[in-house]
């Protein structure tokens, strides 16, 4: 009796304690992106960046996926969104087209049941880069918590993306999942 | 019979919910440190910042571990680090070695097991700052989405240490974890 | 007798369910609030932000509070609190008082328990806006992860507040609950 | 690669320039360093020129030693060397740590 | 600045060696370690305290923070015979010299 009732609760306790764990994995999806510079293009206007490792290096992804350079929704909730772009010139890469330039990112939704896109977050500055310094060096940063549904798409968009700074450490964005919608 | 079972239910449910509640709060680690501006050193050389604060003001820390002036993870995990590191420079202070400047920051990763370290973000900028202003400031701000092994650790270098603002509302890098490894 | 058990034990797991769940959801405040710019104060000072949205494009708020232009805590915990600030310039909006400007953001905490008002978290740049350029921009991020008590007030501070980037994309501050206070 | 050129045997008082050629890697992301070691002695640091062109120097060699830069070169220059500063001279870089070294360029001072 | 001892050791092949440096001001784990052999440049062996360089053998340990650091070599062999400095990359104002005196290792 007592005892069989016991046994019946510690397996109550085992079997949640699994759920539980279990549960609270699969509900927290994530990703960290970096930048895949094989493929920046050239130019000084705004480009959506297409080219971005998900399984190398410090890049991860889990229950969500990336498909055709954008980073897609799989579970609905509240996600805090960032974003990390350096961008350098060095003068042995050439003289830049312009020493006026405006480095900027924009973190971007898609939500394909409504074909429309709209920038959640912006960053950058506008810089003068002179031929009086041989290197120049920016980065941004930007962050910010955002409720996602299932299917939609992040991406991110760039001005001056020739200039990008290919490094993992340099160029990246991700998200991950806080809490779920009420 | 049925009574008995209640209030063993009832033990259950109470336990559980102080072992959930307990378990939730000791599998959290955090930590948010702000520099201890007594013994910044000169140059414009990139260093190591190894004198943090973990227990005064805002600084503080749970289940991970502040030695040698790392950060040591404790637990396995996905955690979401970031920093904010602020220079600045006032025309009473001297004048600057060179008008032309990188302010830059790593945050890096050491495994101890294999002794290697690796960045995982960067961020900065080159800067003009030039003597017809008598003060400048510049704030650079990372964050990003890692996963830890328990006894990697992380750490701050920073380029032109001399230009730290020693404030611990400027000058400060953390860790929170988020979720466990699958 | 066993049938009974098994019945009530499958109750205990699925109330043990929602309450997880349910607790889980309110355990989680959280704020994203965008600038309301019809009301952004003008002059170079160092002012107070008082007008933000909370129900409207990206801007949301549960189980926390914002009145009198403050965010309001409601539950103890662990908060990571963020904030980005844009400021632009365009030559149409008629000339700079001052070419060289400090851009500045603090983000800070009021109890008012202990009417004392300190800040959290600093960042910005000294600029210099020449005439020579017809447009200038210029971002801040920071964020940073704090212990927040049921009460405490959390408010933004700007200079040159008549800068400010009108955009929910690119002004705008938030915060989440990470983890309870042990 | 690092490579020291310009030493010589030199007489007292007189100028010398030393120069350091970079090859393999972008003098922008380093600082670059001079190192001396007397014959049977010990390493000394003289001071770098960072990636803005800033100076620092060793407290014994301010006022003593000038570093300047192009954009593949570093140059050293001792004015009114004395015989103590007959020595190897090493350029490096980066200050922390010294990771490439130069083979060295011998300086003797003596009238 | 840095203070380093012994000036001199002799150690037999496969003993092992301590080599000990001492900060005049606490410079954290910014301390690197180097090897030089007669005629040649100086060559890194560890930097930031403990990590060691790229090709360079695992009997090289480096330990110690603030101000007090251990070179420790295991094994040793033949080939290790040669002066050891360590220098902290710390602070390069208003230092005279950033390199410790040296420590000649002689292999029997």
């Known amino acids: 009796g007592s005892q069989h009732i016991r046994a019946e609760k510690a397996m109550v306790d085992g079997s949640w304690l699994d759920l539980a764990k279990r549960s609270k994995l699969e509900a927290q999806p994530f990703a960290h992106l970096t930048i895949n510079a094989t493929d920046i293009p050239s130019g000084s206007h705004k480009v959506s960046l297409s080219s971005w490792y998900h399984d190398r290096g410090w890049a991860k992804i889990s229950n969500m996926t990336f498909s055709n350079g954008k980073l897609i929704v799989n579970q609905d909730g509240f996600y805090y969104l960032y974003a990390n772009i350096c961008f350098r010139h060095h003068e042995t890469s050439g003289d830049l087209a312009t020493e006026y330039l405006q480095l900027m990112v924009y973190v971007t939704k898609t939500s394909i049941k409504i074909p429309s896109s709209h920038t959640l977050m912006k960053g950058g500055s506008t810089k003068y880069w002179s031929g009086n310094s041989e290197f120049h060096f920016y980065s941004i940063n930007v962050g910010g918590f955002f409720k996602l549904r299932s299917g939609e798409e992040i991406s991110i968009e760039v001005s001056n993306p020739s200039l990008l700074d290919p490094d993992q450490d340099a160029t990246y964005f991700g998200a991950f999942k806080v809490r779920d919608i009420d | 019979g049925s009574q008995h079972i209640r209030a063993e239910k009832a033990m259950v449910d109470g336990s559980w919910l102080d072992l959930a509640k307990r378990s939730k709060l000791e599998a959290q680690p955090f930590a948010h440190l702000t520099i201890n501006a007594t013994d910044i050193p000169s140059g414009s050389h990139k260093v190591s910042l190894s004198s943090w604060y973990h227990d005064r003001g805002w600084a503080k820390i749970s289940n991970m571990t502040f030695s040698n002036g790392k950060l040591i993870v404790n637990q396995d995990g996905f955690y979401y680090l970031y920093a904010n590191i602020c220079f600045r420079h006032h025309e009473t202070s001297g004048d600057l070695a060179t008008e032309y400047l990188q302010l830059m920051v790593y945050v890096t990763k050491t495994s101890i097991k294999i002794p290697s370290s690796h960045t995982l973000m960067k961020g900065g900028s080159t800067k003009y700052w030039s003597g017809n202003s008598e003060f400048h400031f510049y704030s650079i701000n990372v964050g990003g989405f890692f996963k830890l092994r328990s006894g990697e650790e992380i750490s701050i270098e920073v380029s032109n240490p001399s230009l730290l603002d020693p404030d611990q509302d400027a000058t400060y890098f953390g860790a929170f974890k988020v979720r466990d490894i699958d | 007798g066993s049938q009974h058990i098994r019945a009530e034990k499958a109750m205990v797991d699925g109330s043990w369910l929602d309450l997880a769940k349910r607790s889980k959801l309110e355990a989680q405040p959280f704020a994203h609030l965008t600038i309301n710019a019809t009301d952004i104060p003008s002059g170079s000072h160092k002012v107070s932000l008082s007008s933000w949205y909370h129900d409207r494009g990206w801007a949301k708020i549960s189980n926390m509070t914002f009145s009198n232009g403050k965010l309001i805590v409601n539950q103890d915990g662990f908060y990571y609190l963020y904030a980005n600030i844009c400021f632009r310039h365009h030559e149409t909006s008629g000339d700079l008082a001052t070419e060289y400007l400090q851009l500045m953001v603090y983000v800070t905490k009021t109890s008012i328990k202990i009417p004392s008002s300190h800040t959290l978290m600093k960042g910005g740049s000294t600029k210099y806006w020449s005439g020579n350029s017809e447009f200038h921009f210029y971002s801040i991020n920071v964020g940073g992860f704090f212990k927040l008590r049921s009460g405490e007030e959390i408010s933004i501070e700007v200079s040159n507040p008549s800068l400010l980037d009108p955009d929910q994309d690119a002004t705008y501050f938030g915060a989440f609950k990470v983890r309870d206070i042990d | 690669s690092l490579e020291e050129s310009g030493g010589r045997l030199v007489k007292p008082d007189e100028t010398l320039t030393l120069t350091c050629t970079v090859s393999g890697f972008s003098l922008y992301n380093y600082e670059i360093n001079w190192v001396r070691q007397a014959p049977g002695k010990g390493l000394e640091w003289i001071g770098y020129i960072d990636v803005g062109s800033g100076t620092w120097y060793a407290s014994w060699a301010k006022g003593r030693f000038t570093i300047s830069k192009t954009s593949t070169t570093v140059d050293l220059k001792i004015t009114s060397p004395t015989t103590e500063d007959t020595a190897t001279y090493f350029c490096?870089?980066?200050?922390?740590?010294?990771?490439?070294w130069g083979p060295g360029t011998l300086v003797t001072v003596s009238s | 600045d840095m203070t380093q001892t012994p000036a001199s050791v002799e150690v037999a092949v496969g003993g092992t060696v301590t080599i000990k440096c001492q900060a005049s001001?606490?410079?954290?784990?910014?301390l690197a370690w180097y090897q030089q052999k007669p005629g040649q440049p100086p060559k890194l062996l560890i930097y930031?305290?403990?990590t060691v360089a790229s090709g360079v053998p695992s009997r090289f340990k480096g330990s110690g923070f603030g101000t007090q650091f251990t070179l420790t070599i295991s094994g040793v062999q033949c080939d290790d015979a040669a002066t050891y400095y360590c220098?902290?990359?710390?602070?390069?104002?208003?230092?005279?010299?950033?390199f410790g005196g040296g420590t000649e290792v002689v292999v029997k």
């Open positions: 930031s305290t403990s």
């Open positions: 220098q902290q990359g710390y602070s390069a104002g208003n230092v005279n010299n950033p």
């Open positions: 490096t870089r980066k200050y922390n740590p010294m990771d490439l």
């Open positions: 001001q606490n410079i954290g784990s910014n």
